[in-house]
Interface confidence: medium
């Protein structure tokens, strides 16, 4: 299970993104059109410091379908 207080790096970051995003897939860098500020990518945001579930979800490839 994802624990928001920890940092995630390398393969464990990939593993967590797979779990969070499921069959949507994910990006290490968000497509430019989806962010207003220039973001270096998920490594800075979740490996160099801890990040939360909401931030992880912003790296999923397509929006989750609403039920």
């Amino acid at each position: 299970a994802y624990r928001p207080s920890e940092t995630l790096c390398g393969g464990e970051l990939v593993d967590t993104l797979q779990f969070v995003c499921g069959d949507r897939g994910f990006y290490f860098s968000r497509p430019a059109s989806r962010v207003s500020r220039r973001s270096r990518g998920i490594v800075e945001e979740c490996c160099f410091r801890s990040c939360d579930l909401a931030l992880l979800e912003t790296y999923c490839a397509t929006p989750a379908k609403s039920e």
Epitope: G10, E12, L17, G25, F28, R30, C47
Partner: antibody, heavy 120, light 111 residues
Framework: QVQLVQSGAEVKKPGASVKVSCKAS????????INWVRQATGQGLEWMGW????????GYAQKFQGRVTMTRNTSISTAYMELSSLRSEDTAVYYC?????????????WGQGTTVTVSS | QSVLTQPPSVSAAPGQKVTISCSGS????????VSWYQQLPGTAPKLLIY???KRPSGIPDRFSGSKSGTSATLGITGLQTGDEADYYC????????????FGGGTKLTVL
């Protein structure tokens, strides 16, 4: 200096298992993922999976799920890759490689390779 | 069949410049970080470029990397006979079955 030293060549029969070791030195073993990559003679590189030596967590390429197991012994800074149910197509050179995630997913240090031959 | 597509071979004369292309998709190259490796005959691969265009210490500036959309390119200037090797691009593919993926490799011949 930073290096990964792998175990020697192996010859196995079809259906058997092989366990390759990768001993790290010159850096903190638990601070970097270890990846395993193989290369059949005259072919390209094929990624098999990763292991986090600190937690022991692993991730395997879909192709190898159920046949590969990656483990470690942190007390001797050594990673292991075991491949079971060997077939002739598994004949290849197997490499371990260090993954410094802050390099954005490049593998910056490689072992010298271990040749595994599967033959009846 | 590799997820990333490279030309099987390229060649050029000493002193010349050569580029090696690597084509992928939005689930790998476009939104992830590309690395390039050099593999001299009979040796383990060596990291040449990481994070699309950065060189590890010790790699000469004759080697460069770039990325645009779903493609990446390795450039080598001032070719030397010692550059004759296989070159591989690599990144993560972050589609459903996430994992690292390599290009099929490009054999560089220095004429």
């Amino acid at each position: 200096q930073v290096q990964l030293v792998q175990s020697g060549a192996e010859v196995k029969k079809p259906g058997a298992s092989v366990k390759v070791s990768c001993k790290a030195s010159g850096y903190t073993f638990t601070s970097y993922d270890i990846n395993w990559v193989r290369q059949a003679t005259g072919q390209g590189l094929e990624w098999m999976g990763w292991m986090n030596p600190n937690s022991g967590n692993t991730g395997y390429a879909q192709k190898f799920q159920g046949r590969v197991t990656m483990t470690r012994n942190t007390s001797i800074s050594t990673a292991y890759m075991e491949l079971s149910s060997l077939r002739s197509e598994d004949t290849a050179v197997y490499y371990c490689a260090r993954d410094p995630y802050y390099y954005y997913y490049g593998m910056d240090v490689w072992g010298q390779g271990t040749t595994v031959t599967v033959s009846s | 069949q590799s997820v990333l597509t490279q030309p099987p071979s390229v060649s050029a004369a000493p002193g010349q410049k050569v580029t090696i292309s690597c084509s992928g998709s939005s689930s790998n190259i476009e939104n992830n970080h590309v690395s390039w490796y050099q593999q001299l005959p009979g040796t383990a691969p060596k990291l040449l470029i990481y994070d699309n265009n950065k060189r590890p210490s010790g790699i000469p500036d004759r080697f460069s990397g770039s990325k645009s959309g779903t493609s990446a390119t390795l450039g080598i200037t001032g070719l030397q006979t010692g550059d004759e090797a296989d070159y591989y691009c690599e990144t993560w593919d972050t589609s459903l079955s996430a994992g690292r993926v390599f290009g099929g490799g490009t054999k560089l011949t220095v004429l």
